[in-house]
C-alpha cells in the first residue's frame, strides 16, 4: 500500500532560499525534511504554509527534539513571547512578569517585581514581630501619662537586588504609662 508521494532526494529547488539546509524540498511546500541538527519550521503566510530548515527557532518557538527529528514548536505558555521548552518561558509579553518559567500580571507572595527586566525576584524576607516593648518616653517608664511602645522583626533574607526595599522592621504605637508619677 503506497501513496504516490514524490520525494526529491536532492533538493531540486536548491536555488530557492527556503530550500537551504533541506534534504527534501519542493517549490510549493518548501522543505519537508531537514539536514541533521537543523530545526524544521512551518512558516505560515496567510493561507500558505511552507517548511524551512533553521539553525535556531524564531521568537515564539522553541526547539522540540526527538531522535533525529528536530522541529520548531510554538510556545503555548499563556502570555509568553519566547520559551526554552514546552513549559518553560524565558520572556513574557509586555506587561507580564516572568517567574519560574511562567508569566504573571503580578508577582506571587514573597516575590517582588523588577520592572527593568520584568521579572519576579525574591523579595525581602522578614521574621515574626517581637512582643511589644515597655511603654516609655524619653527613656523613662514613668512620669508621663502617654508614651510609645515598639516592636521589631529581623531580616531573615536580604532581597535579590539592592533596589528592592524591605518592609518595615520596627513599628511603634502610643501607649498609656503604667505609672503616671515616678516613685520617690
Amino acid at each position: 500500500q503506497g501513496n504516490r508521494w514524490r520525494r526529491n532526494k536532492r533538493a531540486s529547488y536548491v536555488s530557492n532560499p527556503i530550500c537551504k539546509g533541506c534534504l527534501s524540498c519542493s517549490k510549493d511546500n518548501g522543505c519537508s525534511r531537514c539536514q541533521q541538527k537543523l530545526f524544521f519550521f512551518l512558516r505560515r503566510e496567510g493561507m500558505r504554509q511552507y517548511g524551512e530548515c533553521l539553525h535556531s527557532c524564531p521568537s515564539g518557538y522553541y526547539g522540540h527534539r526527538a531522535p533525529d527529528m528536530n522541529r520548531c514548536a510554538r510556545c503555548r505558555i499563556e502570555n509568553c513571547d519566547s520559551c526554552f521548552s514546552k513549559d518553560f518561558c524565558t520572556k513574557c509579553k509586555v506587561g507580564f512578569y516572568l517567574h519560574r518559567g511562567r508569566c504573571f500580571d503580578e508577582c506571587p507572595d514573597g516575590f517582588a517585581p523588577l520592572d527593568e527586566t520584568m521579572e519576579c525576584v525574591e523579595g525581602c524576607e522578614v521574621g515574626h514581630w517581637s512582643e511589644w516593648g515597655t511603654c516609655s518616653r524619653n527613656n523613662r517608664t514613668c512620669g508621663f501619662k502617654w508614651g510609645l511602645e515598639t516592636r521589631t522583626r529581623q531580616i531573615v533574607k536580604k532581597p535579590a537586588k539592592d533596589t528592592i526595599p524591605c518592609p518595615t522592621i520596627a513599628e511603634s504605637r502610643r501607649c498609656k504609662m503604667a505609672m503616671r508619677h515616678c516613685p520617690g
Epitope: N3, R7, S32, R33, F40, A66, P67, R74
Partner: antibody, heavy 119, light 107 residues
Amino acid sequence: EVQLQESGPSLVKPSQTLSLTCSVTGDSITSGYWSWIRKFPGNKLEFMGYISFSGKTYYIPSLKSRVSITRDTSKNQYYLQLNSVTTEDTATYYCATYHGYGGPWFAYWGQGTLVTVSS
Amino acid sequence: DIKMTQSPSSMYASLGERVTITCKASQDIDSYLSWFQQKPGKSPKTLIYLTNRLIDGVPSRFSGSGSGQDYSLTINSLEYEDMGIYYCLQYDEFPVTFGAGTRLEIK
C-alpha cells in the same frame, strides 16, 4: 514505488517474545524514519515507535520497557521485538514510513500481519 | 499524551452527499494533523497531511481544514469507493496519536 512487507509468526504464546521483520524495497532505510504501528481488534491504532535513518530509536512510554526496534542496513530490513507479551498484544502489526515533519506521515504502509497471543 | 477525539464514531451517508468528519485534540496541535482511510482487509492510506495538503493521486473531493484543537475532513460528493474507516493522526508531539476512527457506510 516504496514497498514494505511484514513477516513473522502469527501465533505467540503469553510471556514469550513477539518478533517481526519489515522488508523494504524502493527506498533505503538509511533515509527517513521507519515505524511500527499496530491495530487492535476494536480498530484502535497505536504508534509503537520508530528507528531513524541513523539508527536512533524512539519508543512510546507505555511500551518502552519491553519493546525494541533494530535494523540491518545490508538487508534493508528493520525489526520489532516485543517482550513478555499478553493477550492484550493481539493485533495487526504494520510497518510504515515517513520522511519528516513537512511530508506526509506514514505515506507508505506494509499490508499488515495479524499476531495472536494465545496459549 | 495528546488525546484525539473523533466524531462521529460511525455514520451512514448517501452517494453524492457531502460528509464531514471531525477530530478534536486535547491541546493545540499547530496543524500537525493527517487523515487516513482504511478499507476492509487493506492497510491505511494517507489522504491528507499538515491539515490540508492533499496527497498526490487522492481525489479532489477530499479536503481538510482546521487549526488549534479542531480539525475536519470533508468529502464533497460521496462515492461508493469512499466507504471505510477514517482516522486522524496528530504528530505535533510524541507519542503521535490516532483518533478512534469513523466508520463510513453507504446508505
